[in-house]
Interface confidence: low
């Protein structure tokens, strides 16, 4: 026999929530269990399905799960079948709906003093309790002539008046939960004595000295009052106009006319309607004075043929917003084609040379018109008028290389020397026509030059070789005054260059021949052993066939070079004592001595009372201070040479004798005692 161990039982359930109808059977043979709903087999779905022998509900549905469920166990072998007790759900639910007009039949039939009934279409089980709201505020039973039943879904307003106007909504709750109306109802019951807007004034923009009209109308029973105010609450009537509104007229129909509008008339105008009852109705409109600013300037534009270009016209600020259009040769541009206007842009597609010229952007509004021209140049690739030529330039003179081209716009020309860009300086100058001037041509200017002529459309280039015709010159020019050391070997060099290698020879300025111990070896004057008689004026002569000769005069002096007889020594002196730095030099001509102390020359005329330089060259410093410490340099010089020697000076504090030392103890370092 089939026995039910657990049978399904009726139970409460919540809409959309889980539920389970239990069923467990015991039988000797293999039984198969299925479920019936109102006698019909239950098909498994994702929402409702058998779980073992029980029936599981993922989400209870009040429509699909209403009825009687029964668990059936069947032994397919014996044909025995057993059925469980019936079970059903008590499904709790609530569902939102709109607030609808129940009476009268349509909104058009709602009149003051008629009965109005609204119905709240929120349904549920168990039966919900309802709450009504007007403009979000709860309504209670009997409040302000409403008859409201909180158990019922109807709200009756008897009689309905203007004070009942508002947005009606409802909410309801039951054991399942709460819901509020999905769509609310706006009740509008006009009070004939309230001012109602018929015609509202609109903002206006007018040009200076033009007229402006504001229209304003209200209706009510009895007819309402209408008043105009300006900005500072100044009333405007035909009898009393404020000084700045002398030209204002209020018409019988409520319209306000302002003639010959001035800037001071601009502002907010208020039209106020007041019925016998109810609040004043205030309408605002603004009078703007039309204005238009100047347009920014365009930079001239250069475009290349075949390209597409756009020029944006920034409209001037203005009220109302100015309209913008482009013109060329007095004709407004179309909105499509090859040259056309797109928004505020001038578009030139596939530019031709003929497109060059002046294009004008116009902007206009009530306040006037503005315009701005843009000059468009269509660039062409440069062509040659004169290319640079291979040239021979003379050293030391200015040289010119030409690069003459023509194009639109005027081409820019740059020059390169040995592939390096030539920047203009004191030696190179590029003229406006493209010619390169080399001031004072030098030997190393002999190289390749290249000029490039460019416009936005393209560039052309050409190059030329410069050969420098070298002048006859000494390299380097001999020093005009030179010294030779007595009784020593000496050389005086002289070299020169030219277009052809020059020959070089020396002679004495008086024309006498050189002594036998003096030789002229390929331009170098050589003295085996200098004597006093070798002093004098000599001339170096360089010459070649094509360029003639050049001369350089040299005065040679014979001198005994400087040596120091006495050199200054490293010296340490007590503060406040006197320092002596000795220095003596000899030579011919007799050398002069200068001292340099702490990196500056000591000027004998500006030494002050503490310092003195003796005739023999020694330097004395009285009352020495720590700041006198440093390196002192003795410089001996004459017209032929210069020598220097240096020694440091240390200034120290005199030590206080300690008791252990005898009165005659020597200082711990070598001192000058004064």
């Amino acid at each position: 026999a089939i026995v039910f161990i657990k049978q399904p039982s009726s139970q409460d359930a919540l809409q959309g929530r889980r539920a389970l109808l239990r069923c467990e059977v015991e039988a000797p043979g293999l039984v198969h269990v299925y479920w019936l709903l109102d006698g019909a087999p239950v098909q498994d779905t994702e929402r409702r399905f058998t779980q073992g022998s029980s029936l599981s509900f993922a989400a209870v549905d009040r429509l699909q799960d209403s009825g009687t469920f029964q668990c059936v166990a069947r032994d397919d072998v014996t044909g025995e079948e057993a059925r469980s007790a019936n079970a059903s759900f008590n499904i709790k639910w609530i569902e939102a709906g709109p607030v609808v007009l129940k009476h009268p039949a349509s909104e058009a039939e709602i009149q003051p003093q008629t009965q109005v009934t609204l119905r709240c279409h929120i349904d549920g089980h168990p039966r919900p309790t309802y709450q009504w709201f007007r403009d979000g505020t709860p309504l209670s039973d009997g409040q302000s002539n409403n008859t409201v039943s909180s158990k019922e879904r109807n709200l009756t307003l008897r009689p309905a008046g203007p004070e009942h106007s508002g947005l009606y909504s409802c909410c309801a709750h039951n054991a399942f939960g709460q819901a509020c109306s999905s769509q609310n109802f706006t009740l509008s019951i006009a009070d004939e004595s309230f001012a109602r807007v018929v015609l509202a004034p609109q903002d206006v923009i007018v040009a200076r000295n033009e007229e402006a009209m504001f229209h304003c109308q209200f209706s009510a029973q009895p007819p309402p009052n209408l008043q105009w105010l300006f900005e500072d609450e100044t009333p405007i009537t035909n009898r009393s106009r404020p000084p700045h509104l002398r030209r204002a007229t209020v018409f019988a129909n409520g319209s306000l006319l302002l003639t010959q509008v001035r800037p001071r008339n601009a502002g907010v105008y208020r039209c106020i309607g007041q019925g016998q009852r109810g609040p004043p109705v205030i309408l605002e409109a603004t009078l703007h004075l039309a204005e238009i600013e100047d347009m920014p300037l365009f930079e001239p534009r250069v475009f290349t043929a075949g390209s597409e270009e756009r020029v944006t016209c920034l409209p001037p600020k203005g009220l109302p917003e100015p309209s913008v259009w482009w013109e060329h040769a007095g004709v407004r541009l179309p909105t499509h084609g090859r040259v056309y206007q797109k928004g505020h842009e001038l578009v030139l597609a596939s530019i031709a040379e003929s497109d060059a010229g002046v294009y004008t952007c116009h902007a206009a509004n009530l306040a006037g018109q503005r315009r701005q021209d843009v000059n468009i140049t269509v660039a062409t690739v440069p062509t040659w008028l004169k290319k640079p030529q291979d040239s021979q330039l003379e050293e030391g003179k200015p040289g010119y290389l030409h690069c003459l081209t023509q194009a639109t716009p005027k081409p820019t020309v740059v020059w390169y020397r040995n592939q390096m860009l030539i920047s203009e300086d004191s030696r190179f100058e590029v003229f406006k026509n493209g010619t390169l001037r080399i001031n004072n041509v030098e030997v190393y200017d002999g190289t390749w030059y290249r000029c490039v002529s460019s416009t936005p459309a393209g560039s052309i280039e050409a190059q030329a070789r410069v050969q420098v015709l070298e002048k006859l010159k000494f390299t380097p020019p001999p020093q005009p005054q030179q010294c030779m050391e007595f009784d020593k070997e000496a050389t005086v060099p002289c070299s020169a260059t030219g277009r052809e290698k020059p020959t070089i020879k020396w002679e004495r300025a008086d024309g006498s021949s050189l002594p036998e111990w003096v030789t002229d070896n390929a331009g170098t004057l050589h003295f085996a052993r200098v004597t006093r008689d070798d002093a004098g004026n000599y001339t170096c002569i360089a010459s070649n066939g094509p360029q003639g000769q050049i001369r350089a005069h040299v005065q040679l002096t014979v001198a005994v070079f400087i040596t120091f007889k006495v050199e200054p020594e490293r010296t340490t002196v007590y503060q406040g004592h006197t320092a002596l730095l000795q220095c003596e030099a000899q030579g011919d001509p007799k050398p002069l001595i200068q001292w340099k102390g702490k990196d500056r020359i000591l000027d004998p005329t500006k030494l002050g009372p503490r310092m003195h330089i003796f005739q023999n060259g020694s330097l004395v410093i009285h009352d020495v201070a720590p700041e006198d410490s440093g390196r002192y340099t003795c410089i001996a010089g004459n017209s032929c040479n210069i020598k220097h020697t240096e020694a440091p000076l240390y200034v120290v504090d005199k030590p206080v004798p300690e008791e252990s030392e005898g009165p005659g103890s020597p200082p711990p370092y070598k001192m000058i005692q004064t």
Epitope: S307, E308, T335, H336, K342, G343
Partner: antibody, heavy 117, light 107 residues
Framework: EVQLVESGGGLVQPGGSLRLSCAAS????????MHWVRQATGKGLEWVSG???????FYPGSVKGRFTISRENAKNSLYLQMNSLRAGDTAVYYC???????????WGQGTLVTVSS | DIQMTQSPSSLSASVGDRVTITCQAS??????LNWYQQKPGKAPKLLIY???NLETGVPSRFSGSGSGTDFTFTISSLQPEDIATYYC?????????FGGGTKVEIK
């Protein structure tokens, strides 16, 4: 908020006609160029036509002579009249607004056109 | 008409990777190029206009560059929400043909 809503799509036989509409809101319709773009299933975007603020129209070669774009500024509406339809015209058709930056800055959700016998 | 060659047609990258897409125009279009993102089942969205300008509200990891005929679109650090197809679009001479698209997937 800018909104573009296409309508008028559906099933049509080869050689037939269909008229698509695009309702615009949330911007000054008359101030903007408007365009139609289509996309066949699993394929890329294909520009179909455009109309500027003056009513000038533009088409690629693939639809020229068969499709006509138009606009009704008073109704904030854009239209695409499609004649002599072919199977290759099957696609989702989008309407798009061309912004001042020349990009299609707002698009509709699309309407499906199926050309099949 | 201008032809646009977009490559690659698809790519797979890891989160955080730098992703680059290129678009080549058959003629000089200056900087007149837009980039769009289209997620499955959605309308395209404008990301970049005039080759390199970011549309308002678009994250700064998206960028574009190039002018003339060669253009590049870059996602500096790929995010899961960037899975989409990306299209380039020129707008020269009143024509608005799109590139073939690049499908971006996460490895």
């Amino acid at each position: 908020e800018v909104q573009l809503v296409e309508s008028g799509g559906g099933l049509v036989q080869p050689g037939g006609s269909l008229r698509l509409s695009c309702a615009a809101s949330g911007f000054t319709f008359s101030s903007y160029d408007m365009h139609w773009v289509r996309q066949a299933t699993g394929k890329g975007l294909e520009w179909v036509s455009g109309i500027n603020t003056d009513g000038d129209t533009f088409y690629p070669g693939s639809v020229k002579g068969r499709f006509t774009i138009s606009r009704e500024n008073a109704k904030n509406s854009l239209y695409l009249q499609m004649n002599s339809l072919r199977a290759g015209d099957t696609a989702v058709y989008y309407c798009a607004r061309r912004g001042w930056n020349y990009g299609f800055d707002y698009w509709g959700q699309g309407t499906l056109v199926t050309v099949s016998s | 008409d201008i032809q646009m060659t977009q490559s690659p047609s698809s790519l797979s990258a890891s989160v955080g990777d730098r992703v680059t897409i290129t678009c080549q125009a058959s003629q000089d279009i200056r900087n007149y190029l837009n980039w769009y993102q289209q997620k499955p089942g959605k309308a395209p969205k404008l990301l970049i206009y005039d080759a390199s300008n970011l549309e308002t509200g678009v994250p700064s990891r998206f960028s574009g560059s190039g002018s003339g005929t060669d253009f590049t679109f870059t996602i500096s650090s790929l995010q899961p929400e960037d899975i989409a197809t990306y299209y380039c679009q020129p707008y020269d001479n009143l024509m608005y043909t799109f590139g073939g698209g690049t499908k971006v997937e996460i490895k």
